[in-house]
């Protein structure tokens, strides 16, 4: 398998919200038209597929409707954000690059991003 | 630059299925789409699927996503195609071609007559 | 996955030139920079004689040329020979792994 070089930060912090972003770099040995991108989360040496998008270069990318995550790409670049995080959801996420087409097929993995996920505190009740 | 060789021709009784095998040697197969094309007698080509071998994963045109089955063997650079429940109509020639962003290599094509 | 839409056939005389037009749509033809075509002669295996549009292989004549405009991708043969009777057939990437054919167009030489 043709080997390609991700890129992604090493820790982000979620929101109070539970809305994470991140940047995933990816070094095309060629034109790539059609890039397929997958979120993989690492938590106890076990991995599950958080959301996947494939899409077209300079078009958006699309998730499943019901999807966690969003997205757009500019160049090699695509940005991501999970959304709905919470305190469980603490864990490696791993962006995994793939060029589709044109061929050759290449593949691409990052060594992951650690997102922290704190669960706000609940408002304590107030006497008004 | 690969080159690609296709099994015998085959003649079948309606109702049952073929599966032709399309033999790479000399150049890259893991990394490559192979796409899988028919021709009816007298008629023109028809895209039905492709699989990159590496993935394994196929992708198959509407039309034909309920009969066909395509697979790749990287261990002996061999793709295949499966189509079951044939009809007279399926009576064609198969051929496995490699995709470089087009189809610049092509199997000899294989012939198989739907017959009862 | 229709196909796409080409001239059932197109004739001219030795020496003459022919142009066959593919019609798709914006998915295919249209959004597509991997539009290629092919000849066959009779109980031969297709070969490529443009791809990505209007790129030549090489051993290909440069009597042949490649062209698109918006869904319409067309193939120009100039300078018509005996040997380019045949049958020519364009093809398109379509996205997500999956290719459309054209219908084909026969050309004969008068």
């Known amino acids: 398998c043709k080997a390609m070089h991700v890129a992604q930060p090493a820790v982000v912090l979620a929101s109070s919200r539970g809305i994470a972003s991140f940047v995933c770099e990816y070094a095309s040995p060629g034109k790539a038209t059609e890039v397929r991108v997958t979120v993989l989360r690492q938590a106890d040496s076990q991995v599950t597929e958080v959301c996947a998008a494939t899409y077209m270069m300079g078009n958006e990318l699309t998730f499943l409707d019901d999807s966690i995550c969003t997205g757009t790409s500019s160049g090699n670049q695509v940005n991501l954000t999970i959304q709905g995080l919470r305190a469980m959801d603490t864990g490696l996420y791993i962006c995994k690059v793939e060029l589709m087409y044109p061929p050759p097929y290449y593949l691409g993995i990052g060594n992951g991003t650690q997102i922290y996920v704190i669960d706000p505190e609940p408002c304590p009740d107030s006497d008004f | 630059q690969v080159q690609l060789v296709q099994s015998g021709a085959e003649v079948k009784k309606p109702g049952s299925s073929v599966k032709v095998s399309c033999k790479a040697s000399?150049?890259?197969?893991?990394?490559?789409?192979i796409s899988w094309v028919r021709q009816a007698p007298g008629q023109g080509l028809e895209w039905m699927g492709g699989?990159?071998?590496?993935?394994?994963?196929?992708k198959y045109a509407q039309k034909f996503q309920d009969r066909v089955t395509i697979t790749a063997d990287e261990s002996t650079s061999t793709a295949y195609m499966e189509l079951s429940s044939l009809r007279s109509d399926d009576t064609a020639a198969y051929y496995c071609?490699?995709?470089?962003?087009?189809?610049?290599?092509w199997g000899q094509g294989t012939m198989v007559t739907v017959s009862s | 996955q229709s196909a796409l839409t080409q001239p059932r056939s197109v004739s001219g005389s030795p020496g003459q030139s022919v142009t066959i037009s593919c019609t798709g749509t914006?998915?295919?033809?249209?959004?597509?920079?991997?539009v290629s075509w092919y000849q066959q002669h009779p109980g031969k295996a297709p070969k490529l004689i443009i791809y990505?549009?209007?790129k030549r292989p090489s051993g290909v004549s440069d009597r042949f040329s490649g062209s698109k405009s918006g869904n319409t991708a067309s193939l120009r043969i100039s300078g018509l020979q005996a040997q380019d009777e045949a049958d020519y057939y364009c093809?398109?990437?379509?996205?997500?792994?999956?290719?459309?054919f054209g219908s084909g167009t026969e050309v004969t030489v008068l």
């Open positions: 071609a490699q995709d470089n962003g087009a189809f610049d290599t």
């Open positions: 000399g150049g890259t197969f893991s990394t490559y789409p």
């Open positions: 699989i990159i071998p590496i993935l394994g994963t196929p």
């Open positions: 914006s998915s295919d033809v249209g959004g597509s920079d991997y």
């Open positions: 990505e549009v209007s």
């Open positions: 093809c398109s990437y379509a996205g997500s792994s999956t290719f459309v």
